[in-house]
Amino acid sequence: TPEVWVQVQMEATELSSFTVHCGFLGPGSISLVTVSWGGPDGAGGTKLAVLHPELGTRQWAPARQARWETQSSISLALEDSGASSPFANTTFCCKFASFPEGSWESCGSLPPSSDPGLSAPPTPVPILRADLAGILGLSGVLLFGCGYLLHLLRRQKHRPTPRLQPSHTNSQALTAQAWAPSQASQAALHDPYATINTSFCPATLDTAHPNGWASLPTHAAHQPQGPAASASTPILARGSFVSVENGLYTQAGERPPHTGPGLTLFPDCRGPRAVEGRFGVR
């Protein structure tokens, strides 16, 4: 069943910069993503950004840049001007909507004890942290290898020293997936890597949309940073909430995506489906 994950990160380089990563894990198509802070959208929260797969993005201060990372995940960079860093104790919520099936939302925050550049799970999760496990495991393997080499050297000085092949460790082994199941859903969680579509297929706008949607910057070169991040961008730890069960299924036989004026889709992209309607184009 579809799930929503939310991760809040403090940038290691700039302590005043935060990034909210949100993603949808499931078989549906997203028609709109809303990021808010201080609570859920429509329930006391304040909108920070709205991302439309075709019309682009709109954002409000202190949001600095909102962008699609994949077809099912987004990131929002925030600039904290205050010295007291109020973001550290703030709840950030992401609402994923698939019209008309429904909307679901999940929230997360950066724990006060978080190290810069890392994000810890929002609630205690009884699993060994994969980053520590990976580092310890790798250290153990190296120590064992060194010991074994010394052992071989002592016992078989007449033999040439065997060459140690470098270990091709997948950087995903260093990723901590600290999933905190919602109280509402106790279903077993599936492998998050299996459901994220890592193809990067955003839509861009050549001009500002008449409804006020801002033009998207060209960002095809950006690497995804969600759970399906490429090996070149390992994430050391990830705190996450998952949403309650909900369903998203693409209705067969619907019209192809509507492209408004000045809209350019990336080639070979099968973006979220467009439900019958005008997307606000007049």
Epitope: K95, G102, S103, C107, Q183, S185, E245, E276
Partner: antibody, heavy 122, light 106 residues
Framework: EVQLVQSGAEVKKPGASVKVSCKAS????????IYWVRQAPGQGLEWMGT????????SYNQKFRGRVTMTRDTSTSTVYMELSSLRSEDTAVYYC???????????????WGQGTLVTVSS | QIVLTQSPATLSLSPGERATLSCSAG?????MHWFQQKPGQAPRLLIY???NLASGVPARFSGSGSGTDYTLTISSLEPEDFAVYYC?????????FGQGTKLEIK
């Protein structure tokens, strides 16, 4: 307080059209979709369609395709459902409802209008 | 469209008893919503996404199921629980409701 207030009862002749309004208050109108459900006397519920109040997208039940039109007026926070080519079997109570957002660890609430009885009779 | 069949059509029970209402889908659906409707009133959401209680719904209500078979259970009936109950699927357009189960006092 969230409220959805619908227009009053209507009596129509076969072949005519009816336009039912649903005025929302107590929340940000464009934050929630509105869907319409009808219920014939003594019968069950039937989904007619949903409108995205923010983008004016609509999704209709194929059964009513071509006969139903849902629109919204953001200036008055009102949604309209128009049903044309009325026949006797369209006699029903028509409800508008605010679609709920499923949010982890927050209360999920739905809100409905009081219903509008539309009678189609010659 | 996906046809939802509720059973039984009418269920006669006494306060304090346990009620089990079933909803069978013509083809597999991902989840089920349940609504309660009392005479002269609009429906009210009880259970969303198969097993989650909507705001203000007493804990005696619970939902379960998967695939094509879903169940609404009321552990101990209160006088205000006697009403008509509808299941609804949103996995496939058009969204459909069951024909309803009338829960009446025996």
């Amino acid at each position: 307080e969230v409220q959805l207030v619908q227009s009053g009862a209507e009596v129509k002749k076969p072949g005519a059209s009816v336009k039912v309004s649903c005025k929302a208050s107590g929340y940000t109108f464009t934050d929630y979709w509105i869907y319409w459900v009808r219920q014939a006397p003594g019968q069950g519920l039937e989904w007619m369609g949903t409108i995205d109040t923010s983008e004016h997208k609509t999704s209709y039940n194929q059964k009513f395709r071509g006969r139903v039109t849902m629109t919204r007026d953001t200036s008055t926070s009102t949604v309209y459902m128009e049903l044309s080519s009325l026949r006797s079997e369209d006699t029903a109570v028509y409800y508008c409802a605010r679609d709920f957002i499923i949010t982890v660890n927050y209360p999920v609430v739905d809100y409905w209008g009081q219903g509008t009885l539309v009678t189609v009779s010659s | 469209q996906i046809v939802l069949t509720q059973s039984p059509a009418t269920l006669s029970l006494s306060p304090g008893e346990r009620a089990t209402l079933s909803c069978s889908a013509g083809s597999s659906v991902n989840y089920m919503h349940w609504f309660q409707q009392k005479p002269g009133q609009a429906p009210r959401l009880l259970i969303y996404s198969t097993s989650n209680l909507a705001s203000g719904v007493p804990a005696r209500f619970s939902g379960s199921g998967s695939g094509t078979d879903y169940t609404l259970t009321i552990s101990s009936l209160e006088p205000e629980d006697f009403a008509v109950y509808y299941c609804q699927q949103r996995s496939s357009l058009p969204f459909t409701f069951g024909q309803g189960t009338k829960l009446e006092i025996k």
